[in-house]
Amino acid sequence: ILGGHLDAKGSFPWQAKMVSHHNLTTGATLINEQWLLTTAKNLFLNHSENATAKDIAPTLTLYVGKKQLVEIEKVVLHPNYSQVDIGLIKLKQKVSVNERVMPICLPSKDYAEVGRVGYVSGWGRNANFKFTDHLKYVMLPVADQDQCIRHYEGSTVPEKKTPKSPVGVQPILNEHTFCAGMSKYQEDTCYGDAGSAFAVHDLEEDTWYATGILSFDKSCAVAEYGVYVKVTSIQDWVQKTIAEN
Amino acid sequence: ILGGHLDAKGSFPWQAKMVSHHNLTTGATLINEQWLLTTAKNLFLNHSENATAKDIAPTLTLYVGKKQLVEIEKVVLHPNYSQVDIGLIKLKQKVSVNERVMPICLPSKDYAEVGRVGYVSGWGRNANFKFTDHLKYVMLPVADQDQCIRHYEGSTVPEKKTPKSPVGVQPILNEHTFCAGMSKYQEDTCYGDAGSAFAVHDLEEDTWYATGILSFDKSCAVAEYGVYVKVTSIQDWVQKTIAEN
Amino acid sequence: VDSGNDVTDIADDGCPKPPEIAHGYVEHSVRYQCKNYYKLRTEGDGVYTLNNEKQWINKAVGDKLPECEAVCGKPKNPANPVQ
Amino acid sequence: VDSGNDVTDIADDGCPKPPEIAHGYVEHSVRYQCKNYYKLRTEGDGVYTLNNEKQWINKAVGDKLPECEAVCGKPKNPANPVQ
């Protein structure tokens, strides 16, 4: 997280830290006592394209709450993970839920309306380009999808699209994604924040919902938008996967 | 009861039989587990006008249900019993309520509207002028009060009133009473039925209410109307008396 | 009004311990009910829970017990209705 | 979500016999509740009564027990709201 705030109060008890076998930090999001969402890209870090979920699972280290180590039983990749950058992690045991460790709810409606502000927490790089020692968070508005597409691909018209990402890497942009823009304070997500939730607080229900999972964390206040997988797009798959595993 | 029906099913579990010390049968009505209503006249049967409630109580025998003898602890006469022909009987023990013994409810509204049909059960004289061996009942409509007054007193105007009862005995008729007429079948109440309830079935609540207590039981299909004490008129006194005793 | 005959009164040695569930606990309660032809009279709801001192307490009336009073005006076999 | 600490779990020797009332009987029941940060998941209402066989039974789900599942999205100390 560039800029933003330190999470001094433990306001994001669903935030997990995932460390790859070559020691890269990324994010994951607790969605019930035994399952977390993260990105497929996070899971494949330092693995070849041919790696299987079985190859990946033992190479990961995962922490919840205040650096509480939890053991991973299995990883399940989204069947279309090249377009839907998502994977599920199942823990060996259910975590004990308390004020430091609590899942975020999955939404029954789509909160990703333009201008809606979400909170994104993360263990990723900060303004010094170092991985942060303390969990940080930033508040970002949902962006106009067409503007985001134009920003990264030059046009919304397939025939006119051309790689235009200001950071050199192109995000996956499709009907399963939404974008959230930098705030006016040049605050943004950055490397290592992927896998974290775009958390929306429904004031009526006083409940926090995972509206998106950060997929493209390379904007780092250079490009204008982070890109998130829409949780409503993957919800049926999530529920089916959990039920079957 | 003249005419009417035998109570073959035990439909009037609030009906009690009271026998005076000179063996006259009258009625009483169970209104809770320990108290019954009857008429003051019933209580004074074969007692002088100067008799007190304490004198009367030991002289009475009382049966509920299927000839179940119950012991009387005390009698309380209405403070204005010459105009409001009512007394209360308190039992030594609470009766056990079952399908044969059950109090009737006291009404929270006045059901004594002209034409309303009530059920009057009783152990009084039948068409042979004998006290009945089996409880009987009759269905009678509430009568127009002015017609009833004219029937017994010739006029509703005080200056013109004159004793006119076809049976020679004048009923007490005032704001605390209502009349119920003979049915077209020449069915009626008769001697010994006094103290019994004019029971109205509230169909909405499926509950039976004691709308009146038969006071004048001498019509016997000769005079046209039986006369009843309105229970709504005595309700406050009943509740106060029970609470204090 | 239901009879209480189909409910086992608790034996003097108390009631069997209910099964435990993870992350949960049980709150014991008794509901006072009345036998046939009686109805509950109480300012509470007739439900009493066990407090720390192992007393049965109702949230509205404390340890004051309800009473069963006779039902009135509900004969088992009422007279046939007026035609 | 309330913690269960303020309710005495029933001792192994069962629960104290509630006082009797005239013409009445008691129906024993337990309400399953969940500790802090958990909520009850059940198709019933979490209330189980003792049947004739001294089994704890819920009228909707029989002897199937409820579960306490984690509450989601209710942090104790939420981030300050969006201005």
């Epitope: 067409d146 134009r150 046009s155 919304t156 018209v157 397939p158 025939e159 006119k160 009907e175 | - | - | -």
Partner: antibody, heavy 118, light 107 residues
Framework: QVQLQQSGPELVKPGASVKLSCKAS????????INWVKQRPGQGLEWIGW????????KYNANFKGRATLTVDTSSSTVYMEIHSLTSEDSAVYFC????????????WGQGTTLTVS | DIQMTQTTSSLSASLGDRVTISCRAS??????LNWYQQKPDGTVKLLIY???RLYSAVPSRFSGSGSGTDYSLTISNLEQEDIAMYFC?????????FGGGTKLEIK
């Protein structure tokens, strides 16, 4: 407000050429593609091609490539379409229309120019 | 080229009716489907772009839906001014292609 004003009706002989014009106003001319669309009497619509005024780049439907040429004059905010070797099949109404980069839709259309080849 | 088919060439409906016009593509066009209205005087207007997005100032009684190869335009409460020809257009692949049109008339 946005307007696309097309040139008047044309009556030409087979084998000749014709140059139709489309003058834009009410918006930043160089920022939006201009598309050309053909409609024969009582028939559907057929896309001919687009031109991007900022750099003059073009895309054509293969059915028209070589016979239709799109050009631009940014000084007058005008786009032109020239069609060569006309036949009776070219008799139609020709529309110019602006592409706002809304997923390949066109939002403002000219009133159309009727071309009769006879 | 991608073929766009509007099977119903003309449609008769009463004022106030709910009317649905359909359009089928010869292959998956990934929601790149736009709808246009052409009035009897020849003027053309954009109604819906990218399957379901309502163009600005278009009345909300118009709506679009669909995915893959099957798409539709719905007018929820037909008004006199809606009498026109309706065309669909795909913008997934060049060349852009249009449906043959559906003429909407009043009964």
């Amino acid at each position: 407000q946005v307007q696309l004003q097309q040139s008047g009706p044309e009556l030409v002989k087979p084998g000749a050429s014709v140059k139709l014009s489309c003058k834009a106003s009410g918006y930043t001319f160089i920022s939006y593609d201009i598309n050309w669309v053909k409609q024969r009497p009582g028939q559907g619509l057929e896309w001919i091609g687009w031109i991007y005024p900022r750099d003059g780049s073009t895309k054509y439907n293969a059915n028209f490539k070589g016979r239709a040429t799109l050009t631009v004059d940014t000084s007058s905010s005008t786009v032109y379409m020239e069609i060569h070797s006309l036949t009776s099949e070219d008799s139609a109404v020709y529309f110019c229309a602006r592409d706002p980069d809304y997923y390949g839709s066109v939002d403002y259309w000219g009133q159309g120019t009727t071309l009769t080849v006879s | 080229d991608i073929q766009m088919t509007q099977t119903t060439s003309s449609l008769s409906a009463s004022l106030g009716d709910r009317v649905t016009i359909s359009c089928r593509a010869s292959q998956d066009i990934r929601k790149y489907l736009n709808w246009y209205q052409q009035k009897p005087d020849g003027t053309v207007k954009l109604l819906i772009y990218y399957t379901s997005r309502l163009y600005s100032a278009v009345p909300s009684r118009f709506s679009g839906s669909g995915s893959g190869t099957d798409y539709s335009l719905t007018i929820s409460n037909l008004e006199q001014e809606d009498i026109a020809m309706y065309f669909c257009q795909q913008s997934d692949r060049l060349p852009y292609t249009f449906g043959g049109g559906t003429k909407l008339e009043i009964k």
